[in-house]
């Protein structure tokens, strides 16, 4: 089964996923896709990254992250109830059937009608942009490497628990990810 | 025009091998998954393989992967199948087939089909 | 894998009718199914994808519903062109399964 995430509308959620590139810059293709993953790619692609850079996106769908190191987790901006649902993360690595792939499920809930200010769950400070710039491009799979045979599941459920950017590091430097070459 | 027209077919004894080709047109074909399936005579059809828009990822029909090889070459335009130690169950006719794309979509259904070449394995 | 079951395996109509034809998946495929026509001697060729949606140059008359394992192909009207045998296929898990096939027939 998925594991879960949630949201209030109107809050940017989080979905993580990383994997720990080979090299600097040996980048792995990655897409993102509402609803749970199908055989090849992701059905219904919000966002697709290639060997270099982010070549297809969809608006309110971004990654946070520096992507260029591995962390291609989502952020969804400003989220509404139907914004709810499974989406796929697949990180594309090259040889025969080698994807991994990573079904996560996005709850959302009604905001609170409340007077007292609450700590909003929003990523945007923990994980500040680092793309400047994204540009269309054919959806190519092209990327070195190889997958030892690592079960990474728990992954969502460690990175479910990311407040802030240490965290995030934490994590990442806990071998918690999918690690190429 | 999209075209998808597939050679190499033939007869050829058990343990034998052959090389199927896959000739596309009418559309930029590195920017396509791409797909064998296969029907028995009389029977359905079987996907056998698909392979990525630069051949650099592979997906096989388990029973088959240690006899069967998926590739393509883009500078040609072409998709290839090259099949050993063939048995008489891969008599079938052999599709070559183009996976639908356009952005915000995934490549798991078919939307170009060639004719098929027939393989028929037998002593 | 993923079964794929389809029923009936053979069906006799007339022009006019309207036809429907099932397709049961072993386990949850969501909204991951295909539709495919194909006549004798000839490929097959893409109906319906994603359960519901109509494959560009595909007449009204055809329509797909149902989510999870449960699905239907449906002719609102035959035409004599539409007797041929159909296909459902799976694109959630590896392999791509297709169903055995249903041969529509005039009676």
């Known amino acids: 089964s998925e594991v879960e995430y949630r949201a209030e509308v109107g809050q940017n959620a989080y979905l993580p996923c990383f994997y720990t590139p080979a090299a600097p810059g040996n980048l792995v293709p990655v897409c993102w896709g509402k609803g749970a993953c199908p055989v090849f790619e992701c059905g219904n692609v919000v966002l697709r990254t290639d060997e270099r850079d982010v070549n297809y996106w969809t608006s309110r769908y971004w990654l946070n992250g520096d992507f260029r190191k591995g962390d291609v987790s989502l952020t969804i901006e400003n989220v509404t109830l139907a914004d709810s649902g499974i989406y796929c993360c697949r990180i594309q690595i090259p040889g025969i059937m080698n994807d991994e792939k990573f079904n996560l499920k996005l709850v959302i809930k009604p905001a609170k009608v409340t007077p007292a200010p609450t700590r909003q769950r929003d990523f945007t400070a923990a994980f500040p942009r680092m793309l400047t710039t994204r540009g269309h491009g054919p959806a190519e799979t092209q990327t070195l490497g190889s997958l030892p045979d690592i079960n990474l599941t728990q992954i969502s459920t460690l990175a479910n628990e990311l407040r802030d950017s240490r965290l995030a590091n934490d994590l990442r430097d806990s071998g918690a990810t999918i690690r190429i070459g | 025009e999209v075209q998808l027209v597939e050679s190499g077919g033939g007869l050829v004894k058990p343990g034998g091998s052959l090389r199927l080709s896959c000739a596309a047109s009418?559309?930029?074909?590195?920017?396509?998954?791409m797909t064998w399936v296969r029907q028995a005579p009389g029977k359905g059809l079987e996907w056998v393989a698909s392979i990525n828009y630069d051949g650099r990822n592979t997906y096989y029909l388990d029973s088959l992967k240690s006899r069967f090889t998926i590739s393509r070459d883009n500078a040609k335009n072409s998709l290839y199948l090259q099949m050993n130690s063939l048995r008489a169950e891969d008599t079938a006719v052999y599709y070559c087939?183009?996976?639908?794309?356009?952005?915000?979509?995934?490549?798991?259904?078919?939307?170009?089909w060639g004719q098929g070449t027939l393989v028929t394995v037998s002593s | 894998d993923i079964q794929m079951t389809q029923s009936p395996s053979s069906l006799s109509a007339s022009v006019g009718d309207r036809v429907t034809i099932t397709c049961r998946a072993s386990e949850n495929i969501y909204s991951y199914l295909t539709w495919y026509q194909q006549k004798p001697g000839k490929a097959p060729k893409l109906l319906i994808y994603n359960a519901k949606t109509l494959a560009e140059g595909v007449p009204s008359r055809f329509s797909g519903s149902g989510s999870g394992t449960d699905f239907t192909l449906t002719i609102s009207s035959l035409q004599p062109e539409d007797f041929a045998t159909y296909y459902c296929q799976q694109h959630y898990g590896t392999p791509l399964t297709f169903g055995q096939g249903t041969k529509l027939e005039i009676k």
């Open positions: 087939a183009r996976g639908y794309y356009y952005y915000g979509s995934s490549p798991n259904y078919f939307d170009y």
């Open positions: 009418g559309f930029t074909f590195s920017d396509y998954y």
